[in-house]
Amino acid sequence: SIPWNLERITPPRYRADEYQPPDGGSLVEVYLLDTSIQSDHREIEGRVMVTDFENVPEEDGTRFHRQASKCDSHGTHLAGVVSGRDAGVAKGASMRSLRVLNCQGKGTVSGTLIGLEFIRKSQLVQPVGPLVVLLPLAGGYSRVLNAACQRLARAGVVLVTAAGNFRDDACLYSPASAPEVITVGATNAQDQPVTLGTLGTNFGRCVDLFAPGEDIIGASSDCSTCFVSQSGTSQAAAHVAGIAAMMLSAEPELTLAELRQRLIHFSAKDVINEAWFPEDQRVLTPNLVAALPPSTHENLYFQ
Amino acid sequence: GAMGQEDEDGDYEELVLALRSEEDGLAEAPEHGTTATFHRCAKDPWRLPGTYVVVLKEETHLSQSERTARRLQAQAARRGYLTKILHVFHGLLPGFLVKMSGDLLELALKLPHVDYIEEDSSVFAQ
């Protein structure tokens, strides 16, 4: 049966035994800045091109055991959520991966900047269709990272990022705080904000919308046919990157402002239990859970 | 995220160091009264001191970025400091990434074309 997260983002009239769109997002390229990935996983094989870009810090600790499957875990799962054959949102989207996070899931602002610059240069050298950049990472507020995101957005690129898993104001983190970036918080199957131990999804006025981000089934790097469930605002952001890819594939001329408006317009409204957020943040936090558009563009979205 | 609202620095730390151009007799000294700023991550554990992104003013060309980076290295060397230019940015933001002692920040902030300098910091998978 259809995983809860795909059911949640699918308009009611398309909810059958399986998630419908076989070719959603085919005109769009999604760049993923994350860990290394297992590109021969059955979910994403032939859909993800691993670029030669790599800029990561050394792993912490003296006893670290580097295992390919662990190094690839985060990125492989997210690539699967965006465009996986069985459990992906935009099954037609092609992806390109850049490695900016090490085997422990840690990167640097400078490495991320160089990655964003790489994408811009690639765009200039070989202009293609609409581009979506998925940034499933967060650090402290960074003026320079936000500025780079702003420049890339002004070049027509759609940037989607994780709000952060710190149960805190997203405005204190980057790239979540960059106004031009679409910042995504995480909700669960009960439309509750996701709790991750003592921490949980970030919130506040720098969040644009929420999306499924708890117990998300996706590609596991343990083997080429394995699946695993993961949680976090990265998974939520991957859903929105997939939805954005489908919207842009249907309407390639959409501006960032129009795409943002559509994402908000088609979201489920006022379903999140706001009591989870600190009192002073409730009015500032958008009560929106991302969803695909209904039948308005039936022929475009569900080919 | 959340467009249409003014940028929020939150706890973001900003050290504003006034530019003084009497040192080194800079040929391309910035206009009087302008200040370049230094920024670092508000969360100390995520700071990566020793690596800095030097961001130059918006219209700075690649050749000027390279020249500014070389000038920093030369001035640092005169003071007995080793520096390493790790990357020169162009395409998105003009500037360069430099590995150097924090002692050189005041010097770097006085270089021509410098808009601000940010200490590198960690980002994490979410």
């Epitope: 055991h65 085997c103 003592t198 | 100390d44 554990p45």
Partner: antibody, heavy 122, light 110 residues
Framework: QVHLVESGGGVVQPGRSLRLSCAAS????????MHWVRQAPGKGLEWVAL????????YYADSVKGRFTISRDNSKNTLYLQMNSLRAEDTAVYYC???????????????WGQGTTVTVSS | QSVLTQPPSVSAAPGQKVTISCSGS????????VSWYQQLPGTAPKLLIY???KRPSGIPDRFSGSKSGTSATLGITGLQTGDEADYYC???????????FGTGTRVTVL
């Protein structure tokens, strides 16, 4: 309900070995780093060891390095502490504790078990 | 020998405020997140504060944390008899690659 339950404590002679277990329930075990912390009678807390969520890295206090080994079985939701060459000064209540977050292991510990007592005595 | 130093004891009357200091160095408190733990008599420790000043849900706002340089402080306002306990600060030490606890402070409500 989030729960950590330690077991395996007891009285052991110096130089012998003991293996402690910590059964976790109520949360996604493989998403969190895990610690062992001990408290000698009438004394303060002493950190013993930490293991990453996926078992890829371990850290130890100098006082136990080379003698104790932390490990985990994510399929069984269980944390272990293998204690070899035990000494009288290892006598303590041993607590397992969950790291606040998987990646930011240095944030501290948010969930603690009730502890299991280890007595090293001849 | 703990690398984080706390006063052995502090006391105050009910309703009053107490502060507990935790002194370290640049390799621990200066550059790492500080947490505070409460250990009531005969029980396991409990997290009170993390990331210098954040409270887990369920911890009343009478408890607060702050950091300045290489020292951290726990504040308890509106002291109650139920607050009688041992309090420990804790943080990662980058030089030792180890988590370190403070020496502990016993809070007595007069």
């Amino acid at each position: 309900q989030v729960h950590l339950v330690e077991s395996g404590g007891g009285v052991v002679q110096p130089g012998r070995s003991l293996r402690l277990s910590c059964a976790a329930s109520g949360f996604t075990f493989n998403s969190f780093g895990m610690h062992w912390v001990r408290q000698a009678p009438g004394k303060g807390l002493e950190w013993v060891a930490l293991i990453w969520s996926d078992g890829s890295d371990e850290y130890y206090a100098d006082s136990v390095k080379g003698r104790f080994t932390i490990s985990r079985d994510n399929s069984k939701n269980t944390l272990y502490l293998q204690m070899n060459s035990l000494r009288a000064e290892d006598t303590a209540v041993y607590y397992c504790a969950r790291a606040i977050a998987a990646l930011y292991y240095y944030y501290g510990m948010d969930v603690w078990g009730q502890g299991t007592t280890v007595t090293v005595s001849s | 020998q703990s690398v984080l130093t706390q006063p052995p004891s502090v006391s105050a009357a009910p309703g009053q405020k107490v502060t507990i200091s935790c002194s370290g160095s640049s390799s621990n408190i200066g550059n790492n997140f500080v947490s505070w733990y409460q250990q009531l008599p005969g029980t396991a420790p409990k997290l009170l504060i993390y990331d210098y000043n954040k409270r887990p849900s369920g911890i009343p706002d009478r408890f607060s944390g702050s950091k300045s340089g290489t020292s951290a402080t726990l504040g308890i306002t509106g002291l109650q008899t139920g607050d009688e306990a041992d309090y420990y600060c804790g943080t990662w030490d980058s030089s030792l690659s180890a988590y370190v606890f403070g020496t502990g402070t016993r809070v007595t409500v007069l």
